[in-house]
Amino acid sequence: CDLPQTHSLGNRRALILLAQMGRISHFSCLKDRHDFGFPEEEFDGHQFQKAQAISVLHEMIQQTFNLFSTEDSSAAWEQSLLEKFSTELYQQLNDLEACVIQEVGVEETPLMNEDSILAVRKYFQRITLYLTEKKYSPCAWEVVRAEIMRSLSFSTNLQKRLRRKD
């Protein structure tokens, strides 16, 4: 399955919007910094096939979409930017979903790498617990915004590598 060219443009737009969403200086939140243990190994693109990589990417975007669709998120960010960001993520989900569905329909498709899916889910669990612990403070959201920028960058790079493989 080939992701449309507009997909990588959407990736970049999502990153730009997330950068614009920053409201407070990252430096004023240094005390709140946290290592969420991003599962980099799931995004190096070497250890599994394209079908599995796309499932992992879908999980990543889906969890990001859910995270920024909460009431607490709505209260934290400028509404129009948040809506545009969510729209970009939603479009990416549609693209990835179409690819996964195509792969599901193909006989002999290797089983999904379930541990990779779980690793992504656990990563977002850590983010969710951090926000809860910090009572969804502005600094906590800023730390999470910076973290999601990093994780989306990994996703973008994996998609570039997948495109080069084709």
Epitope: Q63, E97, V104, K122, F124, Q125
Partner: antibody, heavy 119, light 108 residues
């Protein structure tokens, strides 16, 4: 509010198949994995597997691999769990439970569907 | 597969008493992925505690959770009549996700 409504009780003969449905409402159906958990009479809870309603990919517990099939219909926001080659030990209440994160993990359950396997 | 063993199987106490329920894992479970559920006869399980020690929405403060590694505990500080039920610990740290066999909390 989130609601998961399951199909009614079933009585099946050994060797037959059963298909249980779980209709979701009150949230975006495709955003959360749906899980199936069963409970034999007087016994504990047993996780069977999960499905992502967005694209239909599934993850099954090894114990049920080859006997269970989870599917979904996005037009009706419904997930299905089909169990084949039924035996008496499959007599149980089958629950669907919505995934999520933090306080949302298995925070929402269907009311349960009793499947009785008897000759 | 991570086996969760709950003890005791049955706990007989009176209202007002303190209840301590244990959950022992066959291998280490990250505390972020250890949950507790309550189930009453004829009902679906209800989320009580998430990530070892966090109270789910609407759950009274008399419930608390603790532990790490392989040993986890659910404590009810002062039992109310509605607390008598079966309690399950659950892990989603690794596949397949598993539940303990349950502890039945009954009125003495």
């Amino acid at each position: 509010q989130v609601q998961l409504v399951q199909s009614g009780a079933e009585v099946k003969k050994p060797g037959a198949s059963v298909k249980v449905s779980c209709k979701a409402s009150g949230y975006t159906f495709t955003n959360y994995w749906m899980h199936w958990v069963r409970q034999a009479p007087g016994q504990g809870l047993e996780w069977m597997g999960e499905i992502n309603p967005s694209h239909g990919r599934t993850i099954y517990a090894q114990k049920f691999q080859g006997r269970v099939t989870m599917t979904r219909d996005t037009s009706t926001s419904t997930v299905y769990m089909e169990l084949s080659s039924l035996r008496s030990e499959d007599t149980a209440v089958y629950y669907c439970a919505r995934g999520g994160l933090g306080p949302a993990w298995f925070a929402y359950w269907g009311q349960g569907t009793l499947v009785t396997v008897s000759s | 597969e991570i086996v969760l063993t709950q003890s005791p199987a049955t706990l007989s106490l009176s209202p007002g008493e303190r209840a301590t329920l244990s959950c022992s894992a066959g291998s280490s479970v990250d505390s972020s992925y250890l949950y507790w559920y309550q189930q009453k006869p004829g009902q679906a399980p209800r989320l009580l505690i998430y990530s070892t020690s966090n109270l789910a929405s609407g759950i009274p403060a008399r419930f608390s959770g603790s532990g790490s590694g392989t040993d986890f505990t659910l404590t009810i500080s002062s039992l109310e009549p509605e607390d008598f039920a079966v309690y399950y610990c659950h892990q989603w740290s690794s596949y397949p996700f598993t539940f303990g066999q349950g502890t039945k909390l009954e009125i003495k």
